[in-house]
């Protein structure tokens, strides 16, 4: 019932599940300099009945020994084939965490967790895509992918999404040099936009690094 592959990777896009189907596993990963406690769980598991779902197990990280401070926790070999990384939600995430039947919501952060969350999705899981800030979707409407079982094999449907980063350089009033517009880089967000997350901050790097917008550590 676990999906064999990752959801499709779309250049300059990120994906997220609205909720996680029962059976989904989340690796207990720790940030650099920390490791799982010796008796700690390898993963959290979304379990439940028809009326309520919740995450079993708790992830706990402890400080690594001095000689191991640069060592990151990695999944066990049997875990590695279904690594799906998704963003960590901001503790200030302005989304209600009410439950959906048969699904678990995003687990709350645990102390010293890694900057990326690695999920192991199950058949029937849907993920939604969004172009990263500074890129535009060429198609209208939502973009989503579902893990399906076909002839005994799992596959993810291909989302209808192309994110373009065509540049529009223009002289911004009061600036000495031109800046790229949001097709490539947000131009005026520092003065005209207030945001609740690192969405815009991350894309300051995106124009040159093409980094994911959702891999920042909790502040």
């Amino acid at each position: 019932e676990l999906c064999d592959d990752d959801p499709p990777e779309i250049p300059h896009a990120t994906f997220k599940a609205m909720a996680y189907k029962e059976g989904t596993m989340l690796n207990c990963e720790c940030k650099r300099g920390f490791r799982r406690i010796k008796s700690g769980s390898l993963y959290m598991l979304c379990t439940g009945n028809s009326s309520h779902s919740s995450w079993d197990n708790q992830c706990q990280c402890t400080s690594s020994a001095t000689r191991n401070t640069t060592k990151q926790v990695t999944p066990q070999p049997e875990e590695q084939k279904e690594r799906k990384t998704t963003e960590m939600q901001s503790p200030m995430q302005p989304v209600d965490q009410a439950s959906l039947p048969g699904h678990c919501r995003e687990p709350p952060p645990w102390e010293n967790e890694a900057t990326e969350r690695i999920y192991h999705f199950v058949v029937g899981q849907m993920v939604y895509y969004q172009c990263v800030q500074g890129y535009r979707a060429l198609h209208r409407g939502p973009a989503e992918s579902v893990c399906k079982m076909t002839h005994g094999k799992t596959r993810w449907t291909q989302p209808q999404l192309i994110c373009t980063g065509e540049m529009e350089t223009s002289q911004f009033p009061g600036e000495e040099k031109p800046q790229a517009s949001p097709e490539g880089r947000p131009e005026s967000e520092t003065s005209c936009l207030v945001t609740t997350t690192d969405f815009q901050i991350q894309t300051e790097m995106a124009a040159t690094m093409e980094t994911s917008i959702f891999t920042t550590e909790y502040q």
């Epitope: 939600q89 209208r140 939502p142 989503e144 529009e168 949001p182 947000p186 131009e187 936009l193 609740t196």
Partner: antibody, heavy 122, light 107 residues
Framework: QVQLVQSGAEVKKPGSSVKVSCKAS????????ITWVRQAPGQGLEWMGG????????SYAQKFQGRVTITADESTSTAYMELSSLRSEDTAVYYC???????????????WGQGTMVTVSS | DIQMTQSPSTLSASVGDRVTITCRAS??????LAWYQQKPGKAPKLLIY???SLESGVPSRFSGSGSGTEFTLTISSLQPDDFATYYC?????????FGGGTKVEIK
Amino acid sequence: QVQLVQSGAEVKKPGSSVKVSCKASGGTFSSLAITWVRQAPGQGLEWMGGIIPIFGDASYAQKFQGRVTITADESTSTAYMELSSLRSEDTAVYYCARGGSVSGTLVDFDIWGQGTMVTVSS
Amino acid sequence: DIQMTQSPSTLSASVGDRVTITCRASQSISSWLAWYQQKPGKAPKLLIYKASSLESGVPSRFSGSGSGTEFTLTISSLQPDDFATYYCQQYNIYPITFGGGTKVEIK
């Protein structure tokens, strides 16, 4: 076809707050932005900010910084706009609208709510 | 902020007329411009996105053109249902801004 249904008209005192809801029926938010736009009587349209419900990213126009909070409840497909420290010039029709593509909150708006009239008067 | 200037602010026309509304941006916005129609007491309705793409379900008599700083909305043959106010919107740079509107009224 998704429809956006907004809460009813409100009459508020200066200095108070108002919270307007916007429920999507006939579909979920998925990853499309929900934006709030207001229109004072006889005036044009003014963008306040927006949110991508699933991703939780809210963007606000600086004009409303510190006064507006946009949130979303994915489980009920409802977005909310709360405006505080109301003054008479906040009297307007407040619209929610859905983004036309998954391009963050910097988008055009293909589906609109019916509008909520907020009157601020002492 | 990017200023969007629409002209004319009011336009008197008759059924069957070809109508053109202009929208100018204070700086280049590439093609990230939308046009909306609004009738009294109603929410705006998207007509055109990305400067020239016709929204699904919108009659083909509506068309949009332009890029950079100058854009036009054209109604090839004005119909009774088209008397309304039209707004342009730029979504190239935050904050999103709208033009002041063009009211198309019966001559």
